[in-house]
């Protein structure tokens, strides 16, 4: 938890989602007039996000504690989880309405459907996550979070289809981390880099987090990681407290989330 670049962070909250992202001026927060906010987005090939676009992004985890211009001179910000310091204890778009004075200074919410995105919140029964740009090499300075949330009682079976990240002894440069929880604080499973395929992982509960980070130097081929749902009925009883069976890592039961 904490602030980074003016954004309230638990890694559940995304810095970019559904093509929507937050921008502030180089000089800091709340420095942009409406015209300047439009310019900021247009300089990057985007435009000011509409209220609907901001709400769509919020629904998949976009949470920013900073009011910004939207299309048509509207100002507001997206709140996923209510907090005492942000959003007046409410969730949704905290809407300041259409501003009569376009010279007021706020941040900007941009929309760019072509923006390179990674991560998100996923509830599908199965999916493949790819490093940004895969099969091309991933970029420097990437941070992506994939949060999986299935139905209560289900588990997640993770398998690595392709894996090629910069190798260094402590996996300090580029890495994938897996957490057996809905954040990157609890339930740490492992950190992976290099080009050896890690073994499969089966969660203890219905949630899991994958984090991908790349540093500012060498890049490599990237990865594809697949997950499928394991229904309670199909789970073998031996799985419950076994750390490894064959090529699968089973995690002892710890976390379960509604």
């Amino acid at each position: 938890w904490g602030f980074k670049n003016g954004i309230f962070h638990n890694s559940i909250w995304l810095e970019q989602a559904a093509g929507v992202y937050h921008r502030e001026a180089r000089a800091g927060r709340y420095k942009l007039t409406y015209a300047e906010a439009k310019a900021v987005c247009e300089f990057e090939g985007g435009r000011l996000a509409t209220y609907k676009q901001l709400e769509a992004a919020r629904k998949i985890g976009f949470h920013v504690c900073a009011a910004g211009w939207m299309a048509k001179g509207r100002v507001g910000y997206p709140i996923v989880k209510p907090g005492p310091n942000c959003g007046f204890g409410k969730t949704g778009i905290i809407d300041y309405g259409i501003r009569l004075n376009r010279s007021e200074r706020w941040d900007a919410y941009c929309y760019n459907p072509h923006a390179k995105e990674c991560g998100g919140v996923f509830t599908d029964p199965k999916r493949i996550f790819k490093s940004p740009g895969f099969p091309n090499e991933y970029d420097d300075n990437q941070v992506c979070y994939w949060h999986i949330r299935l139905k209560y009682g289900q588990r997640i079976h993770l398998s690595f289809l392709d894996f090629d990240l910069e190798h260094d002894p402590g996996c300090l440069a580029d890495y994938v981390e897996i957490y057996d929880s809905y954040d990157d604080v609890h339930g740490f499973v492992g950190r992976y880099c290099g080009d050896e395929l890690p073994e499969d992982i089966i969660s203890t509960g219905n949630v899991m987090t994958l984090k991908f980070l790349s540093d500012a130097s060498v890049t490599a081929g990237g990865f594809q990681i697949k997950y499928v749902t394991v229904d309670p009925a199909s789970k073998s009883s031996q799985a419950k407290n076994t750390s490894t069976t064959g090529n699968k890592k089973f995690l002892p039961g710890r976390f379960s989330h509604l």
Epitope: F43, A115, D139
Partner: antibody, heavy 120, light 106 residues
């Protein structure tokens, strides 16, 4: 330290095309934007356009949109500008210049310039 | 297009003299930046964000202004300050430079 190394002087004929290069070192290429600026002999500076290397997005001044094509190769940290259908008015020094991605923009490092001479 | 008009186009000053050059913009900008260019060399960032001196720029230089009107001042002219100074705005597309003020030694 930050360095922008530009390709050498070019001599080209009217109607031809040239590709100028700008190799960046001393910083993370994809974290900054690369702009191109034109300066004709004994004249002022004219902004041509920029590329965002991380995404490949480009934007050119309307005046240069049919003249300049901007590209970047992340693997070699090199930005390129192709100038097509050359005329005598394209004879100039061309600079690449790095800007932060933070609004409003300014150029904090410049290449040494590439002199283009268009002559028949 | 946001046209930047610099004045004077050419000026000369004696060593120790105070020098002020101005830059006016047709559209308001939040910041103005200034570049110094000496003959046959690349421009150098001199002042950014209206009043911040770039690395290595002597303290006798200062910048000020807001909205449509900005200025660069040298409190005490020195021989090494002979150059052309360009104002630049990075707030609006297209990015634009002023035509320059050429500063000579009297």
């Amino acid at each position: 330290q930050v360095q922008l190394q530009q390709s050498g002087a070019e001599l080209a004929k009217p109607g031809a095309s040239v590709r100028l290069s700008c190799q960046a070192s001393g910083y993370t290429f994809t974290s900054y934007w690369m702009h191109w600026v034109k300066q004709r002999p004994r004249q002022g500076l004219e902004w041509i356009g920029y590329i965002i290397p991380s995404s490949g997005y480009t934007k050119c001044h309307q005046k240069f949109k049919d003249k300049a094509t901007l590209t970047a190769d992340k693997s070699s940290s090199t930005a390129y500008m192709q100038l097509s259908s050359l005329t005598y008015e394209d004879s100039a020094v061309y600079y690449c210049a790095r800007s932060t991605s933070g609004y409003p923009y300014y150029f904090d490092s410049w290449g040494q310039g590439t002199t283009l001479t268009v002559s028949s | 297009e946001n046209v930047l008009t610099q004045s004077p186009a050419i000026m000369s000053a004696s060593p120790g003299e105070r020098v002020t050059m101005t830059c006016s913009a047709t559209s308001s900008v939040s910041f103005m930046h200034w570049y110094q260019q000496k003959s046959s060399t690349s421009p150098k960032l001199w002042i950014y964000d209206t009043s911040k001196l770039a690395s290595g720029v002597p303290g006798r230089f200062s910048g000020s202004g807001s909205g449509n009107s900005y200025s660069l001042t040298i409190s005490s002219m020195e021989a090494e300050d002979v150059a052309t100074y360009y104002c630049f705005q990075g707030s609006w597309y297209p990015l634009t430079f002023g035509a320059g003020t050429k500063l000579e030694l009297k």
